[in-house]
């Protein structure tokens, strides 16, 4: 079973992270898939884009996404200088000028178009379940994950340790 | 300061166990996966296991699957590693090392100074 | 399972000489590559985290590069406490350590 602890210990770390730098620390990009192995793909209709989750035909070529990461302070519960150690913080970027959002009031992922600095919106805390197994926790919402409904990304609340284990908020990251 | 502090190494037969203890400080544990690496003497670095922070996943090596467990007690800032049916070829210094990033997996960075393990009749 | 091959095994070089290391994996780890110093006797130490980020209180002659299967680290001018025993690792697919370059001052 995979886990991700302690949602309620860091909300209030989360609130008071600050991104170290200005620039990601690393850069690359990765195909996004589900734990159930379905493509997340991006569509342009209608002048803005669509984010699907779908089993994609044998030949047809996935979606890549740019992945930013960040290094983010947090808050100290046991350290002498103020904070404990690093976070690292992601942003999703799958065209230029286009950051995955979270839409904490509808509950949704969308994509948006914007110039940097990127608001708290599009910065999302990343957990590994192991190295190809990630989370991505909303910055602005601390306990609220990207997940999957219904073929498509929304943001799920995840408020005990037993819902940490589902496995619609992870994702895998390859290169293929 | 981050301290990590290992107990438990020493001289044991082959077949034997020995169950290694890690004590950290200086950082909120429970938000940081946690590994063993082991060194043999004159030799290089092997990554031997790793553990989440909430210690629902483990992984291992696979010469040491089914011989060695990893487990924490974030109560008591502690980790383990249960070595079963040891081998002269476990014989090394047996590093306990923390996760560089909170809840990830990605990079490490505060190791210990290693507690020596010795398999031989 | 990646492997992880660094080249050489044993680097001699001069105080002052701009020093690179190697290292080389089986498939593409995407910048997911840390650099370690280890002097004799004592554990290991982070130098070079994401491939190219100096950890805190890290001389700035040391750097990192590299992307896809090909990574380096470079010291710019060999200092006498530079000499020990240097380790790349891959965090992007498990976790595999190279095994070692040894500096040595000529």
């Known amino acids: 079973a995979f886990g991700i602890s302690g949602v309620q210990k860091y909300t209030r770390a989360l609130h008071d992270s600050s991104i170290t730098g200005i620039s990601p620390i690393t850069e690359y990009l990765a195909s996004l898939s589900t734990y159930n192995d379905q493509s997340i793909t991006f569509a342009l209709e209608d002048e803005s884009y669509e984010i699907y989750v779908e089993d994609l035909k044998k030949d047809e070529k996935k979606d890549k996404v740019l992945l930013s990461y960040y290094e983010s302070q947090h808050p100290s519960n046991e350290s002498g200088d103020g904070v404990d150690g690093k976070m690292l913080m992601v942003t999703l970027s799958p065209t230029k000028d286009f950051w995955l959002h979270a839409n904490n009031k509808e509950h949704s992922v969308e994509l948006h178009k914007c110039e940097k600095p990127l608001p708290d919106q599009a910065f999302f805390v990343l957990h590994n379940m192991h190295s190809n197994c990630v989370s991505f926790e909303c910055k602005t919402d601390p306990g609220v994950f990207i997940g999957v409904k219904d073929n498509h990304l929304a943001l799920i609340k995840v408020d005990s340790s037993e819902n940490l284990c589902t496995e619609n908020i992870l994702f895998k990251l390859s290169e293929t | 300061e981050v301290q990590l502090v290992e107990t438990g190494g020493g001289l044991v037969q082959p077949g034997r166990s020995l169950k290694l203890s890690c004590v950290a400080s200086?950082?909120?544990?429970?938000?940081?996966?946690m590994y063993w690496i082991r060194q043999a003497p004159g030799m290089g670095l092997e990554w031997v296991s790793s553990?989440?922070?909430?210690?629902?996943?483990?992984y291992y090596l696979d010469s040491v699957k089914g011989r060695f467990t990893i487990s924490r007690n974030n109560a008591e800032n502690t980790v383990y590693l249960q070595m079963n049916s040891l081998r002269s070829e476990d014989t090394a210094t047996y590093y306990c090392?923390?996760?560089?990033?909170?809840?990830?997996?990605?990079?490490?960075?505060?190791w210990g100074q290693g507690t020596l393990v010795t398999v031989s009749s | 399972d990646i492997q992880m091959t660094q080249s050489p095994s044993v680097l001699s070089a001069s105080v002052g000489d701009r020093v690179t290391l190697s290292c080389k994996a089986s498939?593409?780890?995407?910048?997911?590559l840390d650099w370690y110093q280890q002097k004799v006797g004592e554990a290991p130490k982070l130098l070079i985290y994401?491939?190219?980020n100096l950890q805190t209180g890290i001389p700035s002659r040391f750097s990192g590069s590299g992307s896809g299967t090909d990574y380096t680290l470079t010291i710019s001018s060999l200092q006498p406490e530079d000499v020990a025993t240097y380790f790349c690792?891959?965090?992007?697919?498990?976790?595999?350590f190279g095994q070692g370059t040894k500096v040595e001052i000529k």
């Open positions: 090392v923390k996760g560089h990033y909170s809840y990830s997996s990605y990079s490490i960075d505060y």
């Open positions: 200086g950082f909120t544990f429970s938000n940081y996966w």
């Open positions: 553990i989440n922070n909430d210690g629902g996943n483990t």
């Open positions: 498939h593409n780890i995407n910048k997911h």
């Open positions: 994401f491939t190219n």
């Open positions: 690792f891959q965090y992007n697919s498990g976790w595999t």
